[in-house]
Interface confidence: medium
């Protein structure tokens, strides 16, 4: 879920989450699994 990164503005938070999701897809891993394994 979308609780991995905090910034002082919601839109910037969302942007970082979008990047994180994209990277997870590129790496061939599911986003949730990647966060869970941290």
């Amino acid at each position: 879920h979308s609780d991995g990164i905090f910034t002082d503005s919601y839109s910037r938070y969302r942007k970082q989450m979008a990047v994180k999701k994209y990277l997870a897809a590129v790496l061939g891993k599911r986003y949730k699994q990647r966060v869970k394994n941290k």
Epitope: H1, S2, D3, F6, S9, Y10, S11, R14, K15, K21
Partner: antibody, heavy 121, light 111 residues
């Protein structure tokens, strides 16, 4: 089918408290950030609060900060808005709304029918 | 706070004609190449309905007579051929900066 059903509205005196609930169904609730938006009678829309999918982070406008608290219970697929120190200007229809996916920050794609809060002595 | 100013306040258009609604932000709502601008439609007694997100992206199920354009501070919602079911109030919303803010709304009616 995505459904959002608000409840808990009513008549309350100035300075009083109220807790709104929103029951969600038809989607993976914990995967979505959620918001409350209100609409005073005959007026436009005003954003009230947002909470992330896991409930870790919340955002509020200054008009309600310190008085309102947004929370969620993902096990119950429910969203809440605790409203304290209510004022006449808080009178409005309160909508529960779901935020869209990661790349569409701030857009709300599903809305409940709303619950009415009236603050009056 | 970013102030969203919609114009006109109300608009009467003949069936089949074009309706254009403008929304001007007091400062840019762009961030990293994206415009954090959303348009909603609200019919009487109903909750708002998402029409367009990220300034120009049509939400699923929204008729393609609706379109959005713009960036920075100036945005436009266009209904290319007004239908009777399009009678409603239309709101713009920015979410680039907290607090998220809405325009005052534009009421669209049939002439």
């Amino acid at each position: 089918e995505v459904q959002l059903v608000e409840s808990g509205g009513g008549l309350v005196k100035p300075g009083g408290s109220l807790r709104l609930s929103c029951a969600a169904s038809g989607f993976a609730f914990n995967n979505y950030d959620m918001s409350w938006v209100r609409q005073a009678p005959g007026k436009g829309l005003e954003w009230v609060a947002t909470i992330t999918g896991g409930g870790s982070y919340t955002w509020y406008p200054d008009s309600v900060k310190g008085r309102f608290t947004i929370s969620r219970d993902n096990a119950k697929n429910s969203l809440y808005l605790q409203m304290n120190s209510l004022r006449a200007e808080d009178t409005a229809v309160y909508y529960c709304a779901r935020l869209t996916g990661y790349d569409q920050a701030g857009a709300m794609d599903y809305w409940g029918q709303g619950t009415t809060v009236t603050v009056s002595s | 706070d970013i102030v969203m100013t919609q114009s006109p306040d109300s608009l009467a258009v003949s069936l089949g004609e074009r309706a254009t609604i403008n929304c001007k932000a007091s400062q840019s709502v762009d961030y990293d190449g994206d415009s954090y601008m959303t348009w909603y439609q609200q019919k009487p007694g109903q909750p708002p309905k998402l029409l367009i997100y990220a300034a120009s992206n049509l939400d699923s199920g929204v008729p393609d007579r609706f379109s959005g354009s713009g960036s920075g501070t100036d945005f436009t919602l266009t209904i290319s051929s007004l239908q009777a079911e399009d009678v409603a109030v239309y709101y713009c919303q920015q979410s680039n900066e907290d607090p998220w803010t809405f325009g005052g709304g534009t009421k669209v009616e049939i002439k």
